[in-house]
């Protein structure tokens, strides 16, 4: 999906009013630190390109994180604010629904969700140059 | 039983506002989008906004904006639309209308209609 | 937002088959794949029978059909049955702050 006509200011809202909340409770109980931030993205349209690569597809180590509170609130702003992104994303995904297990919180997805904190926040800041 | 049930029939006066309210049951009210649509008599549909709960986004058509406040109680699975300086044209048949969850434009199960009539 | 453009009444025999158009601009129908249809019987709310274009809900037969070209889209309903009988809305999706506009409605008369 091609994220460039994203009503990017208005997901950002979304992001700060409540899914930045939830990304957080997710991470509550580690440290800030533990860390170290290795998935980056140049601009608007690639931060989301990479949040929802990382919030949806199955990696090893995290099967899925997309029956989370923080994935589902996502996946509402983005069906919400790119147009054409509930066809070609959550149709796809219907039939890795029906197959999905319990959740569990493993240290891999904790370390994922701590690379999605940084791609959000750096889709906050659109204006900052790649470090 | 999946259903949206509404507030009864209202009579208002010119300037006064509405609010008519709209109990989910049956599904899991936060996922799906709360559209409200009204129906003049003998006239055709006419969408005023939508409330997705989930993210709180509330979205208005721009004919109704400023006049319209669309909310909702997750705790009750309740929503409510309440419509101020009411005119003797906003006189219609008000239905809530479920949006289909994250395909939220269609709407795949309607409340059974509340008649706001607007009458000096 | 303009109302979409459908023709105030159509009509069929039993068995026939009827076509409805929808018209809109390249804001709207041809903007998206998101066009439904609603079916609505006399005092009676609305009941989705279309929705992206061409896909039917669970419940709605086969006899309802729709398509989309251009900045056209239409309901097609085939093997008229007295049932058919009612008005039919479009609606299409317009934007990120317009999730539906509708169509007048058509009245489907079953003769």
């Known amino acids: 999906y091609d994220f460039t006509n994203c009503d990017f200011e208005k997901i950002k809202a979304a992001y700060l009013s409540t899914i930045s909340k939830d990304l957080i409770t997710y991470m509550s109980g580690t440290k800030s630190t533990e860390f170290n931030n290795t998935v980056s993205c140049s601009n608007r349209p690639h931060c989301l390109t990479e949040i929802q690569s990382l919030t949806f597809n199955p990696t090893a180590g995290c099967a899925s994180l997309a029956k989370e509170m923080f994935a589902m609130k996502t996946k509402a702003a983005l069906a919400i604010w790119c147009p054409g992104y509930s066809e070609t994303q959550i149709n796809a995904t219907q039939a890795m629904k029906k197959r999905r297990k319990r959740k569990v919180t493993t240290n891999k997805c904790l370390e994922q969700v701590s690379q999605l904190q940084g791609l959000w926040r750096r889709f906050n800041r659109p204006l900052l140059k790649q470090q | 039983q999946v259903q949206l049930v509404q507030s009864g029939a209202e009579v208002k006066k010119p300037g006064s506002s509405v609010k008519v309210s709209c109990k989910a049951s049956?599904?899991?009210?936060?996922?799906?989008?709360i559209n409200w649509v009204r129906q003049a008599p003998g006239q055709g549909l006419e969408w005023l906004g939508v409330i997705v709960p989930l993210v709180g986004v509330t979205i208005y058509a721009e004919k109704f904006q400023g006049r319209v406040t669309i909310t909702a109680d997750t705790s009750t699975s309740t929503a409510y639309m309440e419509l101020s300086s009411l005119r003797s044209e906003d006189t219609a048949v008000y239905y809530c209308?479920?949006?289909?969850?994250?395909?939220?434009?269609?709407?795949?199960?309607w409340g059974q209609g509340t008649l706001v009539t607007v009458s000096s | 937002q303009s109302a979409l453009t459908q023709p105030p009444s159509a009509s069929g025999s039993p068995g026939q088959s009827v076509t409805i158009s929808c018209t809109g601009t390249?804001?709207?129908?041809?903007?998206?794949?998101?066009v439904s249809w609603y079916q609505q019987h006399p005092g009676k709310a609305p009941k989705l029978m279309i929705y992206e274009v061409s896909k039917r809900p669970s419940g709605v037969p086969d006899r309802f059909s729709g398509s989309k070209s251009g900045n056209t889209a239409s309901l097609t309903v085939s093997g008229l049955q007295a049932e058919d009988e009612a008005d039919y809305y479009c609606s299409s999706y317009a934007g990120t702050d317009t999730f539906a506009i509708f169509g007048g409605g058509t009245k489907l008369t079953v003769l």
């Open positions: 049956g599904f899991t009210f936060g996922s799906y989008g």
């Open positions: 390249t804001s709207d129908i041809g903007g998206y794949n998101r």
């Open positions: 209308a479920r949006g289909q969850e994250y395909f939220y434009w269609y709407f795949d199960l």
